[in-house]
Amino acid sequence: TQNKALPENVKYGIVLDAGSSHTSLYIYKWPAEKENDTGVVHQVEECRVKGPGISKFVQKVNEIGIYLTDCMERAREVIPRSQHQETPVYLGATAGMRLLRMESEELADRVLDVVERSLSNYPFDFQGARIITGQEEGAYGWITINYLLGKFSQKTRWFSIVPYETNNQETFGALDLGGASTQVTFVPQNQTIESPDNALQFRLYGKDYNVYTHSFLCYGKDQALWQKLAKDIQVASNEILRDPCFHPGYKKVVNVSDLYKTPCTKRFEMTLPFQQFEIQGIGNYQQCHQSILELFNTSYCPYSQCAFNGIFLPPLQGDFGAFSAFYFVMKFLNLTSEKVSQEKVTEMMKKFCAQPWEEIKTSYAGVKEKYLSEYCFSGTYILSLLLQGYHFTADSWEHIHFIGKIQGSDAGWTLGYMLNLTNMIPAEQPLSTPLSHSTYV
């Protein structure tokens, strides 16, 4: 065995997406000799780590190693042994950890330190764990979907049928919804990006892109729900919260301490005369929608146009891929079809939210009640965010494509992140200098 085993003619990469509600491990594969070609990297495995997001381990960091074991062992099974030491591993933490860092930098560092130590114990080329910025999350999501759709390629695409075919090289915008944040990223049409914080310049495969991006922290679906509850309990006359975003007959007790645990509810915090309150669902889409709209401050805009909370948003342009929770929620609600108009989506949401909780539980017996109970809120929130938050209209709704996977690879920031860190997106047409990581940071 005095010779290193000849490496396979393929390479692998691993990215862990440490989100606010859970962690997922993605394994990517590509032909070694075609690293700089567009569209050659594809996902071969996704492993969802059992348990919550890493930010929840703040009081039990010693459990992080065990938490990551199953998926890391899965990676050892999927990737040939001869490739392990050459396979880079990256962990990117998103808004859940951004929120923890806001509360305590020391606690966030401790969690990341234990994560790093756990991952470095595996026989891979571990390249570090870090909290990525909201801007990076948006940018990498945009790169992922456009890479997979072949939008950066001047030559024939490597796959036969491209979904969402637009017969041109115009890039797709990216709409990403997580548990704690949401990102909107696209190339505006001949529009100055008035806010420098929202502007990104890329040169990819010999073409320049001026990209708008913004990440709304606290506006992921889970944190938006906490915000809404914190806002609504302020005006409740007692410890009963009659909530239109939950099905009629649904009941759940919420601890006030849990409600105020997240920085996202700080603006609504007040001393309440009770330690717990009970949510009682009344299942009314319209009222739920109205309640959600109160989370978006649209009264102030220092720019020519804003999304909400004074954040610049250029006029929407082109087609958009809506992924992550945008897709999962709409898929559950059976609303991802290109043929379903915005009016139809709204109608179906009205009917869904009005269904009694007992009926819903029977219809979806295989779904965990915690998740099942929140689809009315999440679906309504998605409509509110897209229509009132980002200013999509009934007409432009047809330009939103709810995407789970493209050619077998999940839509999301992880692929774009790996492509960048492994220098697989050249600035010029291959064979030229790859784009440096600093372009994004």
């Epitope: 065995t1 290193k4 392990h84 030491q85 080329d125």
Partner: antibody, heavy 121, light 107 residues
């Protein structure tokens, strides 16, 4: 010919320090994870620790028995592996082997001849 | 950590006989188990890697088997030079650990 040659062993008092070296030749040293394994007199083999590559930020891992006292380092330009041993105890008395795996990982297909460390007052 | 238990501690056999050495892991380690031979005053020598993979230069009479927690090193017909101490090693996860060894002696 692939070769590992250890040096630096000797007699040291408890609480003292010693630095072992391992000179590598016959292979591209910088491309391989390197390890130290020891064997106390009349006893079995015990893994001491490993050091990975520059691309892995020279990451190190140690056996619990030496953690905080021993430090593994490498100088790729000199093709040399080091083991810095501090706060030595009598139970650290052993033959110390420098070892690596030239094929895959976490087994040892190349060994040095070993260097003897004796910790005694 | 993964604990490896080798049995028997000592095995007395004659040249030409078949030797069967056992190694048991405290938890499943798939096939990440390696075997070494050590003679007095010498460094260990790798015999088998990943439970059953043979190594060029090692006589074909040495073979390995097993997966999960139970592993076996077999020497089909003992030669005089095979009498030595044999160690198994966990190559699955850190810390890397060795079994206590089996001493194979001439009967």
């Amino acid at each position: 010919e692939v070769q590992l040659v250890e040096s630096g062993g000797g007699l040291v008092k408890p609480g003292g320090s010693l630095r072992l070296s391992c000179a590598a030749s016959g292979f591209t040293f910088s491309k391989y994870w390197m390890n130290w394994v020891r064997q106390a007199p009349g006893k079995g083999l015990e893994w001491v620790g490993e050091i990975r590559l520059k691309s892995n930020k020279y990451g190190t891992h140690y056996a619990e028995s030496v953690k905080g006292r021993f430090t593994i380092s490498r100088d790729d330009s000199k093709n040399t592996l080091y083991l810095q041993m501090n706060s030595l105890k009598t139970e650290d008395t052993a033959v110390y082997y420098c070892t690596t795996q030239l094929d895959l990982y976490w087994f040892f297909d190349v060994w040095g001849q070993g260097t003897t460390v004796t910790v005694s007052s | 950590e993964i604990v490896l238990t080798q049995s028997p501690a000592t095995l007395s056999l004659s040249p030409g006989e078949r030797a069967t050495l056992s190694c048991r892991a405290s938890q499943s380690i798939s096939d990440y188990l390696h075997w070494y031979q050590q003679k007095p005053g010498q460094a260990p020598r790798l015999l088998i890697y990943y439970a059953s993979q043979s190594i060029s230069g090692i006589p074909a009479r040495f073979s390995g088997s097993g997966s999960g927690t139970d592993f076996t090193l077999t020497i089909s017909s003992l030669e005089p030079e095979d009498f030595a101490v044999y160690y198994c090693q966990n190559g699955h996860s850190l810390p890397l650990t060795f079994g206590g060894g089996t001493k194979l002696e001439i009967k």
